[in-house]
Amino acid sequence: HSDGIFTDSYSRYRKQMAVKKYLAAVLGKRYKQRVKNK
């Protein structure tokens, strides 16, 4: 694809960061719940 560089866009980066943040929050919540239940 001749315009390959444009796939590394800031909008895509922001989406990826939002997903990472969400997953970290979910996994963190699950971990806290497991510790609480022990």
Epitope: D3, G4, I5, F6, D8, S9, Y10
Partner: antibody, heavy 113, light 110 residues
Amino acid sequence: QSVEESGGRLVTPGTPLTLTCTVSGFSLSSAALSWVRQAPGKGLEWIGIIDKGVMSYYASWAKGRFTISKTSSTTVDLKVTSPTTEDTATYFCARGGGEFFIWGQGTLVTVSS
Amino acid sequence: AQVLTQTPSSVSAAVGGTVTINCQSSKSVYNNNWLSWYQQKPGQPPKFLIYQASNLASGVPSRFKGSGSGTQFTLTISDLECDDAATYYCAGGYSGNIVGFGGGTEVVVK
């Protein structure tokens, strides 16, 4: 996520020089990484870009004078083939496909006899 | 080769005022919107301000506004603050995986 440049130093004209950009927090296989330079008191000048660690593209004036290559999973090199005094500048590494959203602090290259 | 021409090269305005910086490209940028803006202060790397012509990067105040399409773009800074004193650059991405920077505009805040 960050990028950091290294390798800047004082060189004599004609002595090949290699600068390194080390990335952390993201994969080169999904990123575009550019080299941009700035001569003292001057503006920003785009040198070239490596896309996903594979294909390199250059400004028309930079072809043959510079080579950009991926050297490891976290490093990209810029080789200045035969520096002249005109190549004295701060060299920045920046992530993004034509919109540069992560910048390093830069590394200073001085070419002088 | 594409050329990005920034005007003016220097502009001065009072605190609370407004400045407008123009960026003209010799050919259309990729997708007609692949134009970004940067702020640079002495001794520092450029700071990413605006992407795809009109979108604010994270943490950038809404006083900064980008507009334009194709070959003509504008950065407007309103309610100027002393901290806005810097040099501003536009950058365009072009088909064929080529990028270019404008020559820069120095903003002086009085």
